[in-house]
Structures are given as structure tokens and as C-alpha cells.
């Protein structure tokens, strides 16, 4: 019958950053196509990426409906040129994904330093609040809206003339740090969810920003 030459997908992997979530799998298709289904533990299966020759499927629209749910996906393999027929009873080969809980597992995207302002021996460093595709009443929510006090930022700062780094932490998006007058400093920030116990607890470091460049402002 029609599915005997198809190969089940394997290595199903979730790739997710700031809730932008893509399911990837293997193999690259030869004479076959794929359809993905996703569901919550208690919900119905919903089909996505119908009869695709790709080996990835963007499931963001589904998971952002409730980022605190746990999701399962499965990938069905069909012969190339397959057309859904009402008379077909044979289930195509498929493979299940690992479970995925976006709130606990999405990676934190690389943060950005929005600005810094020096007033005397104090510098205020502001981290840009990243937007996500999670919505509330048709409004997109920021990372801070979703994670609240679960999300903190770590600031690394050092004198341009030396390599010794200092750190500061905030559960807002702002740091107020003491600096030596007349010295230029460089800054980098990292997003952290302290309640996580896994490798996705921290983001990568932001690009380094240094005083004396356009993001900064100095007032005596």
C-alpha cells in the first residue's frame, strides 16, 4: 500500500528561543513528505505543516496559546505526491517528539543593552525588554510580562583599561552602579531565570557596549 516505502522521522528536536518554537527532525526526505501534529497532554491533535518536504515546522502559533502547558508533537511520513483519501485506513509511520514545556524550556534570547547614562560616579544601564509572540488581548507581551520576577539580569562591567570584571544583578531591567570618575567602562548583560536548574537557565551575553560610544550619555 501507499506508505510501505516511507521512513519514520527520527531525532525530533525542539528549538525554542523567547517562545519562537520550531520542531526539527530527520531525515531529509527522499520520495516522501511530512505532516506534523501537536497537542497538549489533555487536548486534541492539531495538524500543521501539511505534506511538507521540509524537516522543520514552526509551532510557535500553537505553543503561545498557553506557554505553561506541556506539549507533544508527532511527525507523520507519507509518500511524495500523497493526497489525503477518505478511504485510506492504514496509519502512516510516525515518531513522537519529547515533551516540551515552553515556560520551563524556551531558551532566553541574547539581550541588548538599550542605553547607559552616567551622572557623576553613577551609571544607569538599561536592558531592552524583548518582545515575544505570546499575546494577551491581542497585545504582544514582553519577556518581562511573561516571566515577571522569575527573570533577572546580570551585568558584567569593567574598566576599558583593565580586564577585571565586576557583576551586578537586578530583577528589573535597570542597573545603577558606582564607577570611578574619569574612567571609561564597558558593559555586557545576561538574562537569567534562577529557578531553572538546566542548561537553559542563562542567555548568551549581550554584545559589549562601552562608554564613549553613541549608546551612552554623560552628565556631570
Amino acid at each position: 500500500s501507499g506508505t510501505t516505502n516511507t521512513v519514520a522521522a527520527y531525532n525530533l528536536t525542539w528549538k525554542s528561543t523567547n517562545f519562537k518554537t520550531i520542531l526539527e527532525w530527520e531525515p531529509k526526505p527522499i520520495n516522501q513528505v511530512y505532516t506534523v501534529q501537536i497537542s497538549t497532554k489533555s487536548g486534541d491533535w492539531k495538524s500543521k505543516c501539511f505534506y511538507t518536504a521540509d524537516t522543520e515546522c514552526d509551532l510557535t502559533d500553537e505553543i503561545v496559546k498557553d506557554v505553561k502547558q506541556t506539549y507533544l508533537a508527532r511527525v507523520f511520513s507519507y509518500p511524495a505526491g500523497h493526497v489525503e483519501s477518505t478511504g485510506s485506513t492504514e496509519e502512516p509511520p510516525y515518531e513522537n517528539s519529547p515533551e516540551f514545556t515552553p515556560y520551563l524550556e524556551t531558551n532566553l534570547g541574547q539581550p541588548t543593552i538599550q542605553s547607559f547614562e552616567q551622572v557623576g560616579t553613577k551609571v544607569n544601564v538599561t536592558v531592552q525588554d524583548e518582545w515575544t509572540l505570546v499575546r494577551r488581548n491581542d497585545t504582544f507581551l514582553s519577556l518581562r510580562d511573561v516571566f515577571g520576577k522569575d527573570l533577572i539580569y546580570t551585568l558584567y562591567y569593567w574598566k576599558s583599561s583593565s580586564s577585571g570584571k565586576k557583576t551586578a544583578k537586578t530583577n528589573t531591567n535597570e542597573f545603577l552602579i558606582d564607577v570611578d570618575k574619569g574612567e571609561n567602562y564597558c558593559f555586557s548583560v545576561q538574562a537569567v531565570i534562577p529557578s531553572r536548574r538546566t542548561a537553559n537557565r542563562k542567555s548568551t551575553d549581550s554584545p559589549v557596549e562601552c562608554m564613549g560610544h553613541e549608546k551612552g550619555e554623560s552628565r556631570e
Epitope: 497532554k41 498557553d66 505553561k68 502547558q69 506541556t70 514545556t101 515556560y103 520551563l104 538599561t126 536592558v127 525588554d129 494577551r136 507581551l141 514582553s142 519577556l143 518581562r144 510580562d145 511573561v146 516571566f147 515577571g148 520576577k149 522569575d150 527573570l151 530583577n171 528589573t172 531591567n173 535597570e174 534562577p194 529557578s195 531553572r196 536548574r197 538546566t198
Partner: antibody, heavy 120, light 113 residues
């Protein structure tokens, strides 16, 4: 329907140990913080601490740290508040509550409360 | 720790009249990242657990009657009941939901005059 069901009232003597429970249902237990709140007779609300069952991460109010332990068993969707040695001053109503869906959006659901009486 | 102070401690208002409860925090509850104030209001009736009314200082929880409204920013907040009903008799608490430790105001007892 989201529900938090707490264990029944307890009467204990000073120095005894106690564990009270809070069972969550109707939602994904691992992704919401469970909060514990004390209310002494005729008094206001005091936040004791919380736990995120998915990771076991906890936060405590310094006023309660070392005196109570917060834990959770995600396999049975239950959070616990325990004392190793009760004092008469622990006599109070204890509530568990679940955090809201959005960040910092309050304690959206509450258990019915567990009354703990400690008396010699 | 952030200290939450409510005023008045008790309040008597006639049915159908406006009731106003104030809450002051010792530090700002405004999150610079998203410009939200992490101030929450609860209602507690005798013998019952508290009930969430308002979060983010002004967002009504689902199912809460629209006579309840919250306002304010930074350190000064207000809960307003536009037209008091008999079932609104309760103790009202504000809460810092901004940073640990989470702290409550001492409560305001609302009664019918």
C-alpha cells in the same frame, strides 16, 4: 477547573513535627509557583515562601527561613509545608495559592486553608 | 524589604456610595522594562480565603465586577469600589508582587455605614 485542595485541620503539641499538603488540579502543576501564606488569628496575611514544582526552586521569607520547609512532589501534583518542631506561635490558618498565568500577576487561585493549632 | 502601608485601617461607606482604599509602598513597584506596576489587590471575606481582584495595579481579574478598579503608579496606589454593594463587606489587602519577599499591607476593613 483549577483547584487547590489542602489537607485537614491539625492539632499539635509544641515540639512536634507536621507536614500539611496542597494538591493542585486542572492545570499544568509544574509551571506555576505555589505560594504559602500564613494568617494568624484575627491578623493579616504574611507571605512565607513559594516553590516552582517543575524545578523544585524555592524562595523564603527570611522571617520563616529555617523554621519551615517548602517542597513539592510533581508526580502527584502536591506541594507541602512542613515544620520539624512546632511552637505555640505557629497557631494560624495556612493557605496555599497558585501564581497567575502572567508574570507577577498575583495569587490567582487559593486553597481553602489548613488550620493549625499548637497547644500544650 | 518593601513595606506596604494601607489607609485607612477601617472604612464605613453607605450602600451605593464610593469606597476608596489607599496603599503606599516603601519602594517603587514600577518595572522599568515593561512599565507595569506590580501591585495586587485582594478581597477576603470572613471565613474564606482571599480572592484576587486586581493585578498590575489596574488590571481586573477575570470575573471581578467592573465596580472594582485600581489605579496608581510607583509607590502610591488606590482601590476604588464605585458603588458599594452589601457583598463587598470584607477586608482588602494590597500586595507587593514586584520583588521578594512578597509583602502585604496590613489590611483595610470595609463595612456598611
Amino acid at each position: 477547573e483549577v483547584q487547590l485542595v489542602q489537607s485537614g485541620a491539625e492539632v499539635k503539641k509544641p515540639g512536634e513535627s507536621l507536614r500539611i499538603s496542597c494538591k493542585g488540579s486542572g492545570y499544568t502543576f509544574i509551571t506555576y509557583w505555589i505560594e504559602w501564606v500564613r494568617q494568624m488569628p484575627g491578623k493579616g496575611l504574611e507571605w512565607m515562601g513559594d516553590i516552582l514544582p517543575g524545578s523544585g526552586s524555592t524562595n523564603y521569607n527570611e522571617n520563616f527561613k529555617g523554621h519551615v520547609t517548602i517542597s513539592a512532589d510533581k508526580s502527584i501534583s502536591t506541594a507541602y509545608l512542613q515544620w520539624s518542631s512546632l511552637k505555640a506561635s505557629d497557631t494560624a490558618m495556612y493557605y496555599c495559592a497558585r501564581s497567575g498565568y502572567y508574570g507577577n500577576s498575583g495569587f490567582a487561585y487559593w486553597g481553602q486553608g489548613t488550620l493549625v493549632t499548637v497547644s500544650s | 524589604d518593601i513595606v506596604m502601608t494601607q489607609s485607612p485601617d477601617s472604612l464605613a461607606v453607605s450602600l451605593g456610595e464610593r469606597a476608596t482604599i489607599n496603599c503606599k509602598s516603601s519602594q517603587s513597584l514600577l518595572s522599568s522594562g515593561n512599565q507595569k506596576n506590580y501591585l495586587t489587590w485582594y478581597q477576603q471575606k470572613p471565613g474564606q480565603p482571599p480572592k484576587l481582584l486586581i493585578y498590575w495595579a489596574s488590571t481586573r481579574e477575570s470575573g471581578v465586577p467592573d465596580r472594582f478598579s485600581g489605579s496608581g503608579s510607583g509607590t502610591d496606589f488606590t482601590l476604588t469600589i464605585s458603588s458599594l454593594q452589601a457583598e463587598d463587606v470584607a477586608v482588602y489587602y494590597c500586595q507587593n508582587d514586584y520583588t521578594y519577599p512578597l509583602t502585604f499591607g496590613q489590611g483595610t476593613k470595609l463595612e456598611i455605614k
